[in-house]
């Protein structure tokens, strides 16, 4: 069976939107009006992995681009990157571990925990226009809570 996917945008809990910053990086900033069209649309795929009521394994691709968020070790540190893939083979039900995030729903907010690096989360900075990154702390200065907005296909 083909993998189930939906199109969406994400905003952090401070209402910052995610936009492309160069070919392989996302940044978070406040957008208004027509500028909202700059925000990236994700194709969120529901993939194989350990699942519970509030935790669902997903992969986050960029809609109509052969790019996926992935988590790898760089210089001994878990790092978030945008990785290019062969569009003929992705998305797929059994994604490589670096592409898998546990989508965790808490109080109508979403967290995206790396399946490869437990307790590391997709994060944004309080500051404007800073890269989206993989953070190893929750509840500190950095933001790990998001809301999801559905986008029609």
């Amino acid at each position: 069976a083909p993998v189930r996917s939906l199109n969406c945008t994400l905003r952090d809990s401070q209402q910052k939107s995610l936009v492309m910053s160069g070919p392989y990086e996302l940044k978070a900033l406040h957008l208004q009006g027509q500028d909202m069209e700059q925000q990236v649309v994700f194709s969120m795929s529901f993939v194989q992995g350990e699942e519970s009521n509030d935790k669902i394994p997903v992969a986050l691709g960029l809609k109509e681009k052969n790019l996926y968020l992935s988590c790898v070790l760089k210089d001994d540190k878990p790092t978030l990157q945008l990785e290019s893939v062969d569009p003929k083979n992705y998305p797929k039900k059994k994604m490589e571990k670096r592409f898998v995030f546990n989508k965790i729903e808490i109080n109508n907010k979403l967290e995206f925990e790396s399946a490869q690096f437990p307790n590391w989360y997709i994060s944004t900075s309080q500051a404007e226009n800073m890269p989206v990154f993989l953070g190893g702390t929750k509840g500190g200065q950095d933001i790990t809570d998001f809301t999801m907005q559905f986008v029609s296909s």
Partner: antibody, heavy 120, light 107 residues
């Protein structure tokens, strides 16, 4: 010091089920990011990745053999198992287990291998 | 599946030579490539990971390079103990696949 050691039946007949055990020391399969894979090598030929299991129980299989393969682990006993059903003579090979940490995989430590012969 | 091709199945060189072994992927593998040495007794060791990073304990005469689909392993000053078969492995996409191997012999 990390060591891995494979054990198996040595010889078995076509259509039987091959059961392999990888016993390891020097690391724990409960450690986040840890994985163990199985790789085989027919005599005089190249290496073929078969299956892999992660610390969290997530499994991956080579699709060319997927219906025949089952990988499992006993974390407390430091063992990983591979079952191959309905073996044939083409499954005659040396079977290795190897350890990696994180994806993408680099197999950092390898066992010495165990030779399995399938013959009627 | 991603095919990994080591075009040279065997290679003969003299002690002290600089030897290069190549590996080609059927598609871009994002530098997710590692190299392994298999000694005649069957023992397998990791040499290089992530294209060019030297695994701990591996002599510095071994080096790796490449990008996209083309990768290589270089031994800068061949020693007797380097007589072995060398395999590449791609970790970009499941199923993980090995090259067919290059057997290195002494002239």
């Amino acid at each position: 010091q990390v060591t891995l050691k494979e054990s198996g039946p040595g010889i078995l007949k076509p259509s039987q089920t091959l059961s392999l055990t990888c016993s390891f020391s020097g690391f724990s399969l409960s450690t986040s990011g840890m994985g163990v894979g199985w790789i085989r090598q027919p005599s005089g030929k190249g290496l073929e990745w078969l299956a892999h299991i992660w610390w969290d129980g997530d499994e991956s299989y080579n699709p060319s053999l997927k219906t025949q393969l089952t990988i499992s682990k006993d974390t407390s006993r430091n063992q990983v198992f591979l079952k191959i059903t309905s073996v044939d003579t083409v499954d005659t090979a040396t079977y290795f287990c190897a350890r990696n940490r994180y994806d993408p995989p680099w197999f950092v430590d390898w066992g010495q291998g165990t030779l399995v012969t399938v013959s009627s | 599946d991603i095919q990994m091709t080591q075009t040279t199945s065997s290679l003969s060189a003299s002690l002290g030579d600089r030897v290069t072994i190549s590996c080609r992927a059927s598609q871009d593998i994002s530098n997710y490539l590692s190299w392994y040495q298999q000694k005649p007794d069957g023992t397998v060791k990791l040499l290089i990971y992530y294209t060019s990073k030297l695994h701990s304990g591996v002599p510095s005469r071994f080096s790796g390079s490449g990008s996209g689909t083309d990768y290589s392993l270089t031994i800068s000053n061949l020693e007797q103990e380097d007589i072995a078969t060398y395999f590449c492995l791609q970790g970009k996409m499941l199923p993980w696949t090995f090259g067919g191997g290059t057997k290195l012999e002494i002239k």
